[in-house]
């Protein structure tokens, strides 16, 4: 994996100090040749929290596009999920216009639907380099 | 440590136009959110607008949408609000104010001294 | 907008008596994010605001144990256990869930 990237299970992990909007986030991982994190497996779940600390942080799953979706084309309905109880929600009570398109995780670790402009950490992940 | 200094206030007409600054230093301006938060004599606190990290969002209590600009210079550490249009009803005390984290907070942890905006005929 | 109601909206202490301050808001202020954007200000006479609480019970660094806040979903609670002269001031609760922010009317804490 490149420095400051954290290796598990055969895939390169990179978590942000800072915030930015999901959009934002999505961009910052491709030009890294990686994507935001997809969440395949309890296990998998669990190392993205021992690392991430216990603040909002975005991951590669929207539903801007109408049905939830992983950012790899990962199949949503079959895959791994981890919401907060009556999560997502799509809640438009929060003001800042439409409704809740994006997924992060919180505090905890489960996952909840948020405004995808709010500036949350994030993680990106890539596929390990095989010659390394 | 985090210092905010406003600076721009004064006594202008009704109708007419005044541009406040804010002035950080002691940290990654361009990492933070920041809001304006007003106080009328005697009176409580009103937020009035805030501001994303880069620029990209800019949200505004009704009372003064279409009248006031949130902007920044990232470059030059630097918050401003352009108002125009003002009202005897906008003469306050304007605050900086700098989210608490350079991530989504939804709070304020740091606000400067305030600069007096008295619109008077 | 969402309405915070304070009350009291004055209240006068005998330094070393506890103080408790109550904020009801018109909406539930917990997030699906599992947090609950609740805060506290003290505005000290001649100051700008300073942030006391954070999410109804964090006390902000620097920020004496005699202040503690509690409360849920509507309901929120702020008390000093034990007063002192320099606690003089408005105290604000606020909310953040939804844009506008709003804050509750103040209530003025002086020292008997």
């Known amino acids: 994996c490149p420095v400051n990237w954290l290796e598990y299970e055969g895939s390169c992990y990179w978590f942000s100090r800072s915030g930015k909007s999901w959009p934002e986030a999505d961009k910052y991982c491709q030009l890294e040749s990686a994507h935001l994190v997809v969440v395949n497996s309890r296990e998998e779940q669990k190392f993205i929290q021992h690392h991430m600390g216990p603040v909002n942080t975005w991951m590669g799953l929207t539903d801007q596009s109408g049905p939830w979706k992983w950012v790899d084309g990962t199949d949503y309905e079959t895959g791994f999920k981890n919401w907060r109880p009556e999560q997502p929600d799509d809640w438009y009570g929060h003001g800042l216009g439409g409704g809740e398109d994006c997924a992060h995780f919180t505090d905890d670790g489960r996952w909840n639907d948020d405004v995808c402009q709010r500036p949350y950490r994030w993680v990106c992940e890539a596929a390990r380099d095989p010659a390394t | 440590q985090v210092q905010l200094v406003e600076s721009g206030g004064g006594v202008v007409q009704p109708g007419r136009s005044l541009r406040l600054s804010c002035a950080a230093s002691?940290?990654?301006?361009?990492?933070?959110?920041m809001h304006w938060v007003r106080q009328a004599p005697g009176k409580g606190l009103e937020w009035v607008a805030i501001?994303?990290?880069?620029?990209?969002?800019?949200y505004y209590a009704d009372s003064v949408k279409g009248r006031f600009t949130i902007s920044r210079d990232n470059s030059k550490n630097t918050l401003y609000l352009q108002m125009s249009s003002l009202r005897a009803e906008d003469t306050a005390v304007y605050y900086c104010?700098?989210?608490?984290?350079?991530?989504?907070?939804?709070?304020?942890?740091?606000w400067g001294q305030g600069a007096l905006v008295t619109v008077s005929s | 907008d969402i309405v915070m109601t304070q009350t009291p909206l004055s209240l006068s202490v005998t330094p070393g008596q506890p103080a408790s301050i109550s904020c009801k808001s018109s909406?539930?202020?917990?997030?699906?994010?599992?947090?609950?954007?609740l805060y506290w200000y003290l505005q000290k006479p001649g100051q700008p605001p300073q942030l006391l609480i954070y999410?109804?019970?964090n006390r902000f660094s620097g920020v004496p144990d005699r202040f503690s806040g509690s409360g849920s979903g509507t309901d929120f609670t702020l008390k000093i256990s034990r007063v002192e002269a320099e606690d003089v001031g408005i105290y604000y609760c606020?909310?953040?869930?939804?844009?506008?922010?709003?804050f509750g009317q103040g209530t003025r804490v002086e020292i008997k």
């Open positions: 606020m909310q953040s869930i939804q844009i506008p922010w709003t």
């Open positions: 104010a700098r989210d608490a984290h350079d991530f989504w907070s939804g709070y304020f942890a740091y």
């Open positions: 999410e109804v019970s």
């Open positions: 002691g940290f990654t301006f361009s990492s933070y959110g």
């Open positions: 501001i994303w990290y880069d620029g990209s969002y800019k």
């Open positions: 909406q539930s202020l917990l997030h699906g994010d599992g947090k609950t954007y």
